[in-house]
Amino acid sequence: EPPTACREKQYLINSQCCSLCQPGQKLVSDCTEFTETECLPCSESEFLDTWNRETRCHQHKYCDPNLGLQVQQKGTSETDTICTCEEGLHCTSESCESCVPHRSCLPGFGVKQIATGVSDTICEPCPVGFFSNVSSAFEKCRPWTSCETKDLVVQQAGTNKTDVVCGPQDRQR
């Protein structure tokens, strides 16, 4: 009796089970009662990453430098090329088809996590006792100056955007 279902890594065609082509190879011809499935390796610029019956291999992704992309990992016959963004840029999506500049953290915010080629800068508000007076993609919130350790007193309180202003202690005569 002809099969109605096939084993893993097989497919049903013309009432018989044929072997799928292994990753890195494409289908040339289906199996017959006399021959196995005929497969051919993908060319240098192509890949197939699963057991398959595809008659065409997929083109490797192109990391377009005009979009700020660069190759992170060269593709093989079994894997696609992985793109990442040039320095100062990060991917706009998981598939990394284009890049945008990293955002800077505004004054009053510091960098919690520096951006990578695939993720943007993560900012956090400066908590009490810390400040940031610059717009930066690298700088964390800095602690207020400790006037006491300098034998000075606070003349002007700090904010999340400004440091405290220290001054000499008043000498009572």
């Epitope: 040339v28 011809s29 199996c31 017959t32 009662e33 006399f34 021959t35 196995e36 005929e38």
Partner: antibody, heavy 117, light 107 residues
């Protein structure tokens, strides 16, 4: 018991035609692909033709394409090989074989074809 | 066409000894290879399919190995009934092709 019995061989002149038959028994003939394989005096084996179980698909090597026709009559459990424009190099023992698991799992005893002037 | 080259052409052996027969393909055929045995005045019979899978009714002293382009048929402790010609056959692609055979004879 699987049995394949070839017949129809003989001595013919170059350019002549011949039709070989293979009577199959001991299995469901219509469920199996069948092939013809020949063996020359040097004992070399050469695939000649194959036909799918239903008879819809036929396969030939280039050196016999157009000169050989494989066919089957499932109702009669019989396989055929019609050969025309015979050449001296077609001289061989012709075997009928059954295709099981993509192998030639059963062979007949062969029928001899001699092409000579 | 895929060419199968068998070596040696002839192999002389003493019963009880073990032998290895080689079959080399002109390009990769994965494991799509069968082995056949033909005794004197008999038809060929299937010994091994898919390069290494044993066939029901065939003595366990026969085993096959290999993949890609290099294949081996091993006969452990040859018996007198094993003398004859051994053929490999590829079924990776059309046309189906056979090796030239290795004749196993008594030393």
């Amino acid at each position: 018991e699987v049995k394949l019995v070839e017949s129809g061989g003989g001595l013919v002149k170059p350019g002549a035609s011949l039709k070989l038959s293979c009577a199959a028994s001991g299995f469901t003939f219509s469920n199996y692909g069948m092939s013809w394989v020949r063996q020359n005096s040097d004992k070399r084996l050469e695939w000649v033709a194959s036909i799918s179980s239903g008879g819809d698909d036929t396969y030939y090597p280039d050196n016999v394409k157009g000169r050989c026709t494989i066919s089957r009559e499932n109702a009669k459990n019989t396989l055929y090989l019609e050969m025309s424009s015979l050449k001296t190099e077609d001289t061989a023992l012709y075997y009928c074989t059954r295709a099981g698991g993509k192998a030639m799992d059963y062979w007949g005893q062969g029928t001899s074809v001699t092409v000579s002037t | 066409d895929i060419v199968l080259t068998q070596s040696p052409a002839t192999l002389s052996v003493i019963p009880g000894n073990s032998v290895s027969l080689s079959c080399r393909a002109s390009q990769s055929i994965r494991d799509n290879l069968h082995w056949y045995q033909q005794k004197s005045h008999e038809s060929p019979r299937l010994l091994i399919n898919y390069a290494s899978q044993s066939i029901s009714g065939i003595p366990s002293r026969f085993s096959g190995s290999g993949s890609g382009t290099d294949f081996t048929l091993t006969i452990n402790s040859v018996e007198t009934e094993d003398f004859g010609i051994y053929f490999c056959q590829q079924f990776n692609s059309w046309p189906l092709t056979f090796g030239g055979g290795t004749k196993l004879e008594l030393k």
